[in-house]
Amino acid sequence: MKVLQEPTCVSDYMSISTCEWKMNGPTNCSTELRLLYQLVFLLSEAHTCIPENNGGAGCVCHLLMDDVVSADNYTLDLWAGQQLLWKGSFKPSEHVKPRAPGNLTVHTNVSDTLLLTWSNPYPPDNYLYNHLTYAVNIWSENDPADFRIYNVTYREPSLRIAASTLKSGISYRARVRAWAQCYNTTWSEWSPSTKWHNSYREPFEQH
């Protein structure tokens, strides 16, 4: 039994890091493998993660972590019974994938303006709370070509757009994701999408 693709891990910079790897053949990850992880400091405890299957030869492990700080560094040991298959280390602050924003709401009752709001996925004491920027994806359910991305580079979890920038009388969906430039993070997963019917008063045209 050998590791084909070494574990790569990402942290939500709060409570979970997720590690994925591939074995050289079909593996029952939960019965055959264990990933041990330990914070590098004196008297720290070793924790054991039971991996789950992620495709035939793929495994995934969710590592529970206490509040992450930038100095945290973990040793990782992948075992198959008594055999050490791989040894490595992981610094959560250097491999961050933020949590997805939540509670995306489209407010359509503001005169011909669409106000999209969502919630920051971090509590105020978390370092990422004040460092997230967002991308909002809006698309038409009727027309696959009507697909747009708005970059929200300010900290406020909201976006205002004129309803007239979208077609009237059709349904749209929106979703939002986050990233933090300060930690050079990857993008978060997209939030669940929300749907609304876009309608606004067409301006009276004189001929």
Epitope: M65, D67, G102, N103, P121, P123
Partner: antibody, heavy 115, light 107 residues
């Protein structure tokens, strides 16, 4: 091995105060965020409060906000819960529980609020 | 605040039965969900975290699934020592909230 031992429970009248303690051993307390969780007699679990190892930030359940204060003394390996303006509905066994996500619990201390 | 609704609140089952307990969150919590077991007079112990990750030392007959707002704890073949109360917990945001509990009793 990890051990959490709560103390300070007892009988108190409505409107009174009590201070619970939780002494930790078997791990580096200063590196762990901590929680208080309670359970009223015959009822379910209710999260009460949290204190971060990283920032010292604190969070509370709405039911205790403004009345309870969580704190810690890393030099004494101790977690505290100062409970003021106690009500009948605060009667419960109070547990301290370690992060991440309540991996270890103490045995609990019973707080009875009654006149 | 996020509400966690567990069902059923109580159930009777026999040794060897397959038992399923569900937990519904009032809003999306991704996979930030854990399951705990509590036996009478004892302290709760964590069975599952991150919705589907089995806690080390917990028998493999316990499994968890779900994401977003719908979650399930399954006991594939109920054993005598599994008669207890089970709680779900969301730790997606503060305040953290538990489900009201499911008591699994002997039929």
């Amino acid at each position: 091995q990890v051990q959490l031992v709560e103390s300070g429970g007892g009988l108190v009248q409505p409107g009174g105060s009590l201070r619970l303690s939780c002494v930790a051993s078997g791990f580096t307390f200063s590196h762990s965020s901590m929680n208080w969780v309670r359970q009223a007699p015959g009822k379910g679990l209710e999260w009460v409060s949290y204190i971060s190892r990283a920032t010292g930030a604190v969070y509370y359940a709405d039911s205790v906000k403004g009345r309870f204060t969580i704190s810690r003394d890393n030099a004494k390996n101790s977690l505290y819960l100062q409970m003021n303006s106690l009500r009948d509905e605060d009667t419960a066994v109070y547990y301290c529980a370690r992060e991440p996500v309540f991996d270890y619990w103490g045995q609990g201390t019973l707080v009875t609020v009654s006149s | 605040d996020i509400q966690m609704t567990q069902s059923p609140s109580a159930m009777s089952a026999s040794v060897g039965d397959r038992v399923t307990i569900t937990c519904r969150a009032s809003q999306d919590i991704s996979n930030y969900l854990a399951w705990f077991q509590q036996k009478p007079g004892k302290v709760p112990t964590r069975l599952i975290y991150a919705a589907s990750s089995l806690q080390s030392g917990v028998p493999s007959r316990f499994s968890g699934s779900g994401s977003g707002t719908e979650f399930t704890l399954t006991i594939s073949s109920l054993q005598p020592e599994d008669f207890a109360t089970y709680y779900c917990l969301q730790w997606s945001s503060y305040p953290r909230t538990f489900g009201q509990g499911t008591k699994v009793e002997i039929k």
